[in-house]
């Protein structure tokens, strides 16, 4: 089977959502946990993560073979404390398989804005913290 993990971000007003999406087959979900780490280059684990989520075994419908499960970590107001390097990971507690997504960063600037860099598929986002809009 093939399990795929991607990272993305979205902004809602002053909130920043960091999203880890895992695509997997129904039968591959059992025992899998997806988690988001900050500033953990080597020891990213569910125990040291900001948030974790068990993969769903049921896509809700029967006519599909692949499921997407989404972990969303919401930062209500980005501050300098949120600057750092983030990574989406997944691990099977059953088989020991480990997946690591690309590193991405939040950079808080002196002007009160922040940027999210390192996201794939045109996901380099630059946000204005004060205005709450894409800049």
């Amino acid at each position: 089977g093939c399990i795929n993990i991607t990272s993305s971000a979205s902004q809602e007003g002053t909130r920043l959502n960091l999203i880890c999406t895992v695509w997997h087959k129904k039968e591959e979900a059992e025992g899998f946990v997806v988690f988001l780490c900050k500033d953990r280059s080597g020891d990213c684990s569910p125990e040291t993560s900001l948030k974790q989520l068990r993969l769903k075994r049921d896509p809700g419908i029967d006519g599909v073979g692949e499921i997407s499960s989404q972990l969303m970590f919401t930062i209500s107001q980005v501050t300098p404390l949120h600057s750092g390097t983030y990574q989406c990971c997944a691990r099977s507690q059953k088989s020991g398989i480990r997946l690591q997504g690309h590193f991405f960063s939040i950079l808080f600037t002196e002007t009160g804005n922040y940027t999210v860099t390192g996201l794939k598929q045109r996901q380099h986002l630059e946000f204005s913290h004060n205005e709450g809009t894409l800049s």
Partner: antibody, heavy 121, light 107 residues
Framework: QVQLVQSGAEVKKPGASVKVSCKAS????????MQWIRQAPGQGLEWIGA????????RVTQKFRGRATLTADKSTSTAYMELSSLRSEDTAVYYC??????????????WGQGTTLTVSS | EIVLTQSPATLSLSPGERATLSCRAS??????LHWYQQKPGQAPRLLIK???QSISGIPARFSGSGSGTDFTLTISSLEPEDFAVYFC?????????FGGGTKVEIK
């Protein structure tokens, strides 16, 4: 044993909103899709949408998109369905129902008792 | 959206008779179809899962068949408590949908 207990009957005016709750017990709430279905007086069953409490993945049918909001509180094992901009045609019994294990049951194996919503000026 | 068409809308039969209810899907849904029974003032009850699989606690006189687009619910010998409304529902794709229902009434 699995139980779904819904909130009581509601009477609302056109344009108002309503929030119906469905408290689940007897199973792992976050592992099963919760459905919302309604039935107007003398009519058939109409699927509104579903939510997976494990990751808050929610699906709402086109007709109710923008008007129905599905949420779930894992700490209390309670699912909610909020319907806004109510009109008289929304008068119906609203049910929550659990989708059974995929490929094993698949259908809606447990149902709430129903919540009657009356929209009238 | 998959449309499920149930026929007939009403079936008038006597106790002891055989009831045959039909559900037709607007496109192929494999065996991803379920049947429910609903009595007045009650929530629906799951009768048959995945077109033909029985449910624990449901009498053996209820059976289902079909695959693809055409499905049938059969009640081999109607009991007084079987007079109710029957709905089919597909779980093949979003949005999930129900058929319009068939009312089985006493002749």
């Amino acid at each position: 044993q699995v139980q779904l207990v819904q909130s009581g009957a509601e009477v609302k005016k056109p344009g108002a909103s309503v929030k119906v709750s469905c408290k689940a017990s007897g199973y792992t709430f976050s592992d099963f899709w919760m459905q919302w279905i309604r039935q107007a007086p003398g009519q058939g069953l109409e699927w509104i949408g579903a939510i997976y409490p494990g990751d808050d993945d929610a699906r709402v049918t086109q007709k109710f998109r923008g008007r129905a909001t599905l949420t779930a509180d894992k700490s209390t094992s309670t699912a909610y369905m909020e319907l806004s901009s109510l009109r008289s045609e929304d008068t119906a019994v609203y049910y929550c129902a659990r989708r059974g294990i995929a490929a094993v049951v698949g259908g809606f194996d447990y149902w709430g008792q129903g919540t009657t919503l009356t929209v009238s000026s | 959206e998959i449309v499920l068409t149930q026929s007939p809308a009403t079936l008038s039969l006597s106790p002891g008779e055989r009831a045959t209810l039909s559900c037709r899907a607007s496109q192929s849904i494999s065996n991803h179809l379920h049947w429910y029974q609903q009595k007045p003032g009650q929530a629906p009850r799951l009768l048959i899962k995945y077109a033909s699989q029985s449910i624990s606690g449901i009498p053996a006189r209820f059976s289902g068949s079909g695959s693809g687009t055409d499905f049938t619910l059969t009640i081999s010998s109607l009991e007084p408590e079987d007079f109710a409304v029957y709905f089919c529902q597909q779980s093949n794709s979003w949005p999930l949908t129900f058929g319009g229902g068939t009312k089985v009434e006493i002749k």
